[in-house]
């Protein structure tokens, strides 16, 4: 019977007693960083080359013995899981395989920098198809290592890698930390996070997404025909390397982008136990299992958005924290998150001619986070409108004036350290849907954007008592854009996009009295692109 | 239920060309490796060699590479040995099996082809 | 490439008497990374094709009677009939299924005495 991590990637109209998906990677070539392989296992051979690149380390100890089945037996495996044609996810893609760890698992920063520069001089010697490149590997941070990825993945390239076997944040390693890079965390048959003896799986903002990981059948070193089941994050990636390699054959043109916001669209949300996780890193990290898409075609009508949180701000006065995009995206809102509701907002601003999202801490704050809002809009002309403090009872309104324009976020920054404590909310006039609204402290910002067929509505959910989470979803075919709380409820946290709902948290409910300040409501942006939907349709 | 079912036996003159077959049925034909074995009058079972129909990928014992050609055509689950140019030492029973990633040995098998090359 | 020598090459055993088969390979179809060895065992009667008795060297077929058995490890192995039936008249061969080429033993006769 179908291996559970081949059924658990399978959408429910292809499960079978046999995987078969409708594509199996053929017009895609994946590159392995990793051991040495065997390539004549036959559920690899013909569709591995191993190059004769190799960049390696002596190994470690006197008493070391070189033998060949496990020297080759993390790479072997490897191979299997991406394009084996018995347990492989991706049985059309073919593969090319670097070594680049040596018979104990060790690599060096020196080494993988050779290795991806080999292949980025491959590519512009013999350009093919589509390119994945498998970094199965973790080390320390590495601003060098980060930088090559980050060379590679702007050159037309998708980079999949481990998020590290450390029971850590995957901040603290690379090439996971690179964003550039999609970062893989490992799940198991229950879709819980891997436990790997005392450490398990890294988490954190840095991981994209999770994928099976734990007791994962795959190709052994040990002979021709034997098979062994691995664990780890390495498992993982190469379960996204070969959904990707998927994709890409299916929709060669995809931009890394695109890519990164389908694998993430078409995952399994929520289905992670977050207790697992350190407190201080559930919010941050994503709950999504891969998954191929049900249909390898037609998903280009959607409008695809993902959350990218930034780094933590620091505890300092005047700390910010700041979240980007990728260069193909879109931001179309910004919102913040801070542990101890001490706060300065946050707003969209221009840096090296893209908008970024910043968060602002406050006096007596330990830090907070920005939260970016990133979307694939093509042909979109986004600008930010500002309101500056009105001062006026009624608070700052911004909407988006020009034609044409829709309203897809609202963000809010304050200078005043302890901003409405003592105000009642202030409500949104009914009937002007694209207008942001905030204290009258406040300078209120609002992301307006033009884009074919572009439209969006507000969605508003209030509970009058206290509240630790207020949440707010866009319906089916709709997308939420923009996030925020509405102005008033000065206990809380902050707001941020999970999927397709708005969080609002607000501080423990046991702290707060339950007046007109414990009024909380989340307020949701939800858009849709009629130009996207007719295109697709015209493409079928 | 699941069968492997082969060809009738062939009677050959040497140098003659000869395609025999094996449809598989009651299974995912496309998802098993299909055997090929010899066995010479009163002799033992050897293995030729192998063929995986979901991609056609094909595996030669040293012994018969060159000398025969594994084929599949997985629209019609039927997999085929072939000789270009047979040899009385051909002469032989031929049995085809199936096996599984998970299950490397041969749990069923055909009838088997005999193939009598005279002159 | 692997070589499997059974022995012996014949065996005549009385109704109801133990017969067993031994077959050695040339290195261990024994591997670590799943702890099985890669040995199968296959019975052929006149005029019909082998059929599967015994793999991973110990574990018996479904529909296989009880009374044939596998065991071994490593480079050695042993098919045993432990109460020999007229319908056991046949050729037992041992396979080795873990390196290519896959390669049998010379097979073992068992005759009623």
């Known amino acids: 019977s179908i291996p559970w991590n081949l059924e658990r990637i399978t959408p429910p109209r292809y499960r079978a007693d046999e995987y078969q998906p409708p594509d199996g990677g053929s017009l895609v070539e994946v590159y392995l960083l990793d051991t040495s392989i065997q390539s004549d296992h036959r559920e690899i051979e013909g569709r591995v080359m191993v190059t004769d690149f190799e960049n390696v380390p002596e190994e470690d100890g006197t008493r070391f013995h070189r033998q060949a089945s496990k020297c080759d037996s993390h790479g072997t495996h490897l191979a299997g899981v991406v394009s084996g044609r018995d347990a492989g996810v991706a049985k059309g893609a073919s593969m090319r395989s670097l070594r680049v760890l040596n018979c104990q698992g060790k690599g060096t920063v020196s080494g993988t920098l050779i290795g991806l520069e080999f292949i980025r001089k491959s590519q512009l010697v013999q350009p093919v198809g589509p390119l994945v490149v498998l970094l199965p590997l973790a080390g320390g941070y590495s601003r060098v290592l980060n930088a090559a990825c980050q060379r590679l993945a702007r050159a037309g390239v998708v980079l999949v890698t481990a998020a590290g076997n450390f029971r850590d944040d995957a901040c603290l390693y690379s090439p996971a930390s690179a964003p550039e890079v999609i970062t893989v965390g490992a799940t198991n048959a229950q879709d819980q996070p891997v436990t790997l003896g005392t450490l398990g799986t890294n988490f954190g903002r840095c991981v994209d997404l999770f994928a099976p990981g734990e007791d994962i059948i795959g190709a052994s070193s040990d002979c021709s025909t034997c098979f062994v089941s691995q664990s780890g994050t390495s498992q993982a990636a190469a379960h996204v390397a070969g959904i990707a390699a998927m994709m890409l054959s299916a929709e060669p043109e995809l931009t890394l982008a695109e890519l990164r916001q389908r694998l993430i669209h078409f995952s399994a949300k929520d289905v992670i136990n977050e207790a697992w996780f350190p407190e201080d890193q559930r919010v941050l990290t994503p709950n999504l299992v891969a998954a191929l898409p049900p249909s390898t075609h037609g998903a280009g009508w959607q409008l695809f958005c993902r959350t990218v949180w930034s780094a933590h701000s620091g505890p300092t006065r005047m700390a910010t924290a700041v979240a980007r995009c990728a260069p193909d995206e879109e931001l179309l809102s910004c919102s913040s998150f801070s542990r101890s509701g001490k706060r300065r907002g946050e707003r969209m601003e221009a840096q090296g001619g893209k908008l970024v999202c910043r968060a602002h801490n406050a006096f007596g704050g330990e830090g907070v986070y920005a939260i970016a809002r990133c979307c694939l809009l093509p042909q979109a002309n986004c600008s930010v409108h500002t309101a500056p403090p009105a001062e006026a009872s009624m608070g700052t309104r911004v909407h988006c004036h020009q034609q044409g324009h829709v309203l897809t976020g609202c963000s809010s920054h304050w200078e005043v350290e302890d901003l409405g404590t003592h105000k009642p909310p202030v409500l949104r006039p009914r009937g002007q849907p694209n207008q942001c609204v905030g204290h009258r402290e406040a300078s209120i910002h609002a992301s307006c954007c033009h884009a074919p067929g572009l439209e969006c509505k507000v969605k508003e959910h209030g509970i009058p008592a206290p509240q630790e989470q207020v949440t707010v979803a866009c319906e089916e075919g709709w997308t939420l854009t923009g996030c925020s709380a509405l102005p008033g409820t000065s206990h809380v946290l902050g707001a941020y996009a999970v999927d397709n709902t708005c969080v609002v948290r607000s501080r423990d409910v046991s702290t707060t009295g339950s007046t007109s300040e414990g009024a909380v409501t989340a307020v949701a942006i939800c858009c849709r692109s009629r130009h996207l939907a007719q295109a697709s349709q015209e493409l079928q | 239920q699941v069968q492997l079912v082969q060809s009738g036996a062939e009677v050959k003159k040497p140098g003659e060309s000869l395609k025999i077959s094996c449809k598989g049925s009651?299974?995912?034909?496309?998802?098993?490796?299909i055997t090929w074995v010899r066995q010479m009058p009163g002799k033992g079972l050897e293995w030729m060699g192998l063929i995986y129909p979901g991609d056609s990928y094909t595996r030669y014992s040293p012994r018969f590479q060159g000398q025969v050609t594994i084929s599949a055509d997985k629209s019609i689950s039927t997999a085929y040995l072939q000789w270009s140019s047979l040899k009385a030492s051909d002469t032989a029973m031929y049995y085809c099996?199936?096996?599984?990633?998970?299950?490397?040995?041969?749990?069923?098998w055909g009838q088997g082809t005999l193939v009598t090359v005279s002159s | 490439d692997i070589v499997m020598t059974q022995s012996p090459d014949s065996l005549a055993v009385s109704l109801g008497e133990r017969a067993t088969i031994n077959c050695r390979s040339s290195?261990?179809?024994?591997?670590?990374?799943?702890?099985?060895?890669?040995l199968a065992w296959y019975q052929q009667k006149p005029g019909q094709p082998p059929k599967l008795l015994i793999y991973w060297a110990s574990t018996r077929e479904s529909g296989v009677p009880d009374r044939f058995s596998g065991s071994g490890s490593g480079t050695d192995f042993t098919l045993t009939i432990s109460s020999l039936q007229a319908e056991d008249v046949a050729v037992y061969y041992c396979q080795q299924y873990s390196s290519f080429p896959i390669t049998f033993g010379q097979g073992t006769k068992v005759e009623i005495k």
């Open positions: 290195q261990s179809v024994l591997y670590s990374s799943n702890n099985k060895n890669y």
């Open positions: 099996a199936r096996d599984h990633w998970s299950r490397p040995y041969s749990d069923v």
């Open positions: 009651g299974y995912s034909f496309t998802n098993y490796y």
